[in-house]
């Protein structure tokens, strides 16, 4: 049910990367506005993005309160200029989102290689520990803070002169790998959460190669 001049939202979709979380939906409004509500399974509904003509709503502030909770959102449709109007059942038209559990489902953002240092035939590669919007004690937590040992990084490394990519893994943010003396190598990292069933991998970091300014070489 609902008013004759509003249509229900549809294609409600969660878009989330490193816990920055936006709910998107359709259609673009014509003579109507939307309000979003979000709740945990056992909690109360909280309204966000009041009477908006947007078709997205940033719900990050709500989900970062507990990223391991499962959330449900709903989008209400109101006639523009008459937001008190309700449907025949006494409430405005609305549509529910799929459930969303940030810890299990947020996409892993593209990592960045912070630095690499060669000492003889060893190279230490360090991955930047990206800050998230999750807070604890008024400070923003890093991706490692949130995921702990659930988060691993895979390093792909290869000789500049070849294409075959060797791999290494770490559950810290550092790799120590063996390389051939006198060879230049390139590096790319991928974040992985093996315990997940979906959204397990990030896109690869930008490639960094030896001989570029990020690296440091020391002959021992």
């Amino acid at each position: 049910s609902g008013t004759t001049n509003t249509v229900a939202a549809y294609n409600l979709t969660w878009k989330s990367t490193n816990f920055k979380t936006i709910l998107e939906w359709e259609p673009k409004p014509v003579n109507q506005v939307y309000t979003v509500q979000i709740s945990t399974k056992s909690g109360d509904w909280k309204s966000k993005c009041f009477y908006t003509t947007d078709t997205e709503c940033d719900l990050t502030d709500e989900i970062v309160k507990d990223v391991k909770q499962t959330y449900l959102a709903r989008v209400f449709s109101y006639p523009a200029g008459n937001v008190e109007s309700t449907g025949s059942a006494g409430e405005p038209l609305y549509e529910n989102s799929p459930e969303f559990t940030p810890y299990l489902e947020t996409n892993l953002g593209q990592p960045t290689i912070q630095s690499f240092e060669q000492v003889g035939t060893k190279v230490n590669v360090t991955v930047e520990d990206e800050r998230t919007l999750v807070r604890r004690n008024n400070t923003f937590l890093s991706l490692r803070d949130v995921f702990g040992k659930d988060l691993i990084y895979t390093l792909y490394y290869w000789k500049s002169s070849s294409s075959g990519k060797k791999t290494a893994k770490t559950n810290t943010n550092e790799f120590l790998i063996d390389v051939d003396k006198g060879e230049n190598y390139c590096f790319s990292v991928q974040a992985v959460i093996p315990s997940r069933t979906v959204n397990r991998k990030s896109t690869d970091s930008p490639v960094e190669c030896m001989g570029q300014e990020k690296g440091e070489f020391r002959e021992i």
Epitope: K149, I152, T154, Y156, S163, G164, K165, K166, T167, A168, K169, T170, N171, D178, Q190, V192, P194, R196, T197, V198, R200, K201, T203, D204
Partner: antibody
Framework: EVQLVESGGGLVQPGGSLRLSCAAS????????IHWVRQAPGKGLEWVGY????????YYADSVKGRFTISADTSKNAAYLQMNSLRAEDTAVYYC??????????????WGQGTLVTVSS | DIQMTQSPSSLSASVGDRVTITCRAS??????VAWYQQKPGKAPKLLIY???FLYSGVPSRFSGSRSGTDFTLTISSLQPEDFATYYC?????????FGQGTKVEIK
């Protein structure tokens, strides 16, 4: 149910080519890593190469480098082993296997049934 | 490449026996070792991962342990269905490498 099914094996002459397929079901290959392993008659297991279907990264055993190519088609949820310039010593049963991680330790939890490649004139 | 030296290459044992198979890595591989069982004409099956973790569905008579670069697969009480070939494998570095295999035969 997770399953890997290889196909495409057969008899081929030395110098010839063959393309093996590894069709996956019950999981999405882009979330994992796919390895190819072979076993010559009466011999042990020999690693051939791997692909990360998510980004296309590959690496090959020295014995097949430059002759074999691993690829993946995530829309078909399948991986492939293109074998060129085949030699008698490539005769083996070829397996594909899914790799996953336990924290940082890898393990290969699902294997295909294998497909026999015979290189002979 | 890391070599995995597996011993013995074969052994004869009776049902109920305790069987131990060892693998020595040519360099440090941390806990990145798995053990597989293979029966004739079949694909290998994962038994142990991360040196000592029993894979889901594998009987508890199988166990794995690590001491430095030495890795051990133990079958506490051999059952008729355990007669097979066993392989260790390291995946600490690329390329991953297998041991030569241990064939467990009926005495």
């Amino acid at each position: 149910e997770v399953q890997l099914v290889e196909s495409g094996g057969g008899l081929v002459q030395p110098g010839g080519s063959l393309r093996l397929s590894c069709a996956a079901s019950g999981f999405t290959i882009s979330g994992y890593w796919i390895h190819w392993v072979r076993q010559a008659p009466g011999k042990g297991l020999e690693w051939v190469g791997y692909i990360d279907p998510y980004n296309g990264a590959t690496y090959y055993a020295d014995s097949v480098k430059g002759r074999f190519t691993i690829s993946a088609d995530t829309s078909k949820n399948a991986a492939y082993l293109q074998m060129n310039s085949l030699r008698a010593e490539d005769t083996a049963v070829y397996y594909c296997a899914r790799a996953d991680y336990f924290y940082i330790d890898e393990y290969w939890d699902y294997w295909g049934q294998g497909t026999l490649v015979t290189v002979s004139s | 490449d890391i070599q995995m030296t597996q011993s013995p290459s074969s052994l004869s044992a009776s049902v109920g026996d305790r069987v131990t198979i060892t693998c020595r890595a040519s360099q440090d591989v941390n806990t990145a070792v798995a053990w597989y069982q293979q029966k004739p004409g079949k694909a290998p099956k994962l038994l142990i991962y991360s040196a000592s973790f029993l894979y889901s569905g594998v009987p508890s008579r199988f166990s794995g342990s690590r001491s430095g670069t030495d890795f051990t697969l133990t079958i506490s009480s051999l059952q008729p269905e355990d007669f097979a070939t066993y392989y260790c494998q390291q995946h600490y570095t690329t390329p991953p490498t297998f041991g030569q295999g241990t064939k467990v035969e009926i005495k």
